[in-house]
């Protein structure tokens, strides 16, 4: 699998992973104890036909061209978890691995 | 996890899974011996904020609102394989489980 990495200075128009730090404090989410912020990343860019397509299915739908089917869009194709310490709303504090919090790779699907 | 199912008569505008039969014969893909066709399904529809969001990450990116981040798009969130019998281009016929050929669920990511 392959995906492009970009930053705020990139001129890349195609589907790419960009850096993004999520700051829970700035959101006012005080139920999250730790981390205060983390590197989440995000996907942005154009999905020209076949470029970075994750699934053969994407190609097949393009071929079949059903009514209302949009072209593929730039979306996370690989994600990873982070460990968080948080209030669970029942006066308990929980440490847990929260899935799909970090974008590791972007692609077209 | 939850996803909407629609058909060609549905008036649903939100992200939904629609039926789609992929016909390899119609594509002229004669290197596929079997199946000749299969139910692939596809995703289509709008992703209003928070509706059918697969990942907490999607919500966080919306909150952080970085430059160039598009809203979430309607994309497969659960897929399954099919078994296929096909010529592999080296004069061999292969029977194999091909991943991510069928859309089981659609969501916004």
């Amino acid at each position: 699998d392959f995906g492009l990495d970009c930053d705020e200075h990139s001129t890349e128009s195609r589907c790419c992973r960009y850096p993004l730090t999520v700051d829970f404090e700035a959101f006012g989410w005080d139920w999250i104890i730790a981390p205060k912020r983390y590197k989440a990343n995000y996907c942005s860019g154009e999905c020209e036909f076949v470029f970075l397509q994750k699934y053969p299915h994407t190609h097949l739908v393009h071929q079949a061209n059903p009514r209302g089917s949009a072209g593929p869009c730039c979306t996370p194709t690989k994600m990873s978890p982070i460990n968080m310490l948080y209030f669970n709303g029942k006066e308990q504090i929980i440490y847990g691995k929260i899935p799909a919090m970090v974008v590791d790779r972007c692609g077209c699907s | 996890d939850f996803g909407l199912d629609c058909d060609e008569h549905s008036t649903e505008s939100r992200c939904c899974r629609y039926p789609l039969t992929v016909d390899f014969e119609a594509f002229g893909w004669d290197w596929i011996i079997a199946p000749k066709r299969y139910k692939a399904n596809y995703c289509s529809g709008e992703c209003e904020f928070v509706f059918l969001q697969k990942y907490p990450h999607t919500h966080l990116v919306h909150q952080a609102n970085p430059r160039g981040s598009a809203g979430p798009c309607c994309t497969p969130t659960k897929m399954s394989p099919i078994n296929m019998l096909y010529f592999n281009g080296k004069e061999q016929i292969i029977y194999g489980k091909i991943p991510a050929m069928v859309v089981d669920r659609c969501g916004c990511s």
């Epitope: 005080d30 139920w31 104890i33 730790a34 981390p35 205060k36 460990n83 | -």
Partner: antibody, heavy 116, light 107 residues
Framework: EVQLLESGGGLVQPGGSLRLSCAAS????????MSWVRQAPGKGLEWVST????????SYPDSVKGRFTISRDNSKNTLYLQMNSLRAEDTAVYYC?????????WGQGTLVTVSS | DIQMTQSPSSLSASVGDRVTITCKAS??????VAWYQQKPGKAPKLLIY???YRYTGVPSRFSGSGSGTDFTLTISSLQPEDFATYYC?????????FGGGTKVEIK
């Protein structure tokens, strides 16, 4: 430099009340959850309570639930522990601590003695 | 509640020795274990959090390992200032609980 200074400890009779304070400096107090931990004389450590950075969420062990109340005043950079219906087994040094994944900075503690 | 059983309760060692302290949780706590050092009459200090992450400013001779139920604090080469009591703590779910402590004394 991070500093946490507890005060308000002392001798109190069983059934009595006491309010502990913890004055914080050297960090952005309103950004961090805070905890209280106690240590009975010659014994180990026992977690007492934690409060979220904004004060909306709290947690306690059963041993103090309903008797102790943690609170904070972010405008004064101060953490509090209101202790009611005190018992002899509440006798301990009470520490306030800055909370991250673990308690990463502790004050020097204030001694609470519950005795008749 | 999750019990944290620490061993040994005390040990004698010399400067330069490699010291290992273990902590066993009564149930799986993932990697949510912290280690603290406490000297007589002083407040505890954080050494390790999330099983293996050394806190800022903690010397590299301190290391933590483990996941699930079994955890270890290792001091690779004991220094004079390391004679103290060490506590493990689970930060997996409240009520947070501490081990009984390990007193490291001079041999």
């Amino acid at each position: 430099e991070v500093q946490l200074l507890e005060s308000g400890g002392g001798l109190v009779q069983p059934g009595g009340s006491l309010r502990l304070s913890c004055a914080a400096s050297g960090f952005t107090f309103s950004s961090y959850a805070m905890s209280w931990v106690r240590q009975a004389p010659g014994k180990g450590l026992e977690w007492v309570s934690t409060i979220s950075s904004g004060g909306s969420y709290t947690s306690y062990p059963d041993s103090v639930k309903g008797r102790f109340t943690i609170s904070r005043d972010n405008s004064k950079n101060t953490l509090y522990l209101q202790m009611n219906s005190l018992r002899a087994e509440d006798t301990a040094v009470y520490y306030c601590a800055k909370q991250d994944y673990a308690m990463n900075y502790w004050g020097q503690g204030t001694l609470v003695t519950v005795s008749s | 509640d999750i019990q944290m059983t620490q061993s040994p309760s005390s040990l004698s060692a010399s400067v330069g020795d490699r010291v290992t302290i273990t902590c066993k949780a009564s149930q799986d706590v993932s990697t949510a274990v912290a280690w603290y050092q406490q000297k007589p009459g002083k407040a505890p200090k954080l050494l390790i959090y999330s099983a293996s992450y050394r806190y800022t400013g903690v010397p590299s001779r301190f290391s933590g390992s483990g996941s699930g139920t079994d955890f270890t604090l290792t001091i690779s080469s004991l220094q004079p200032e390391d004679f103290a009591t060490y506590y493990c703590q689970q930060h997996y779910s409240t009520p947070w609980t501490f081990g009984g402590g390990t007193k490291v004394e001079i041999k």
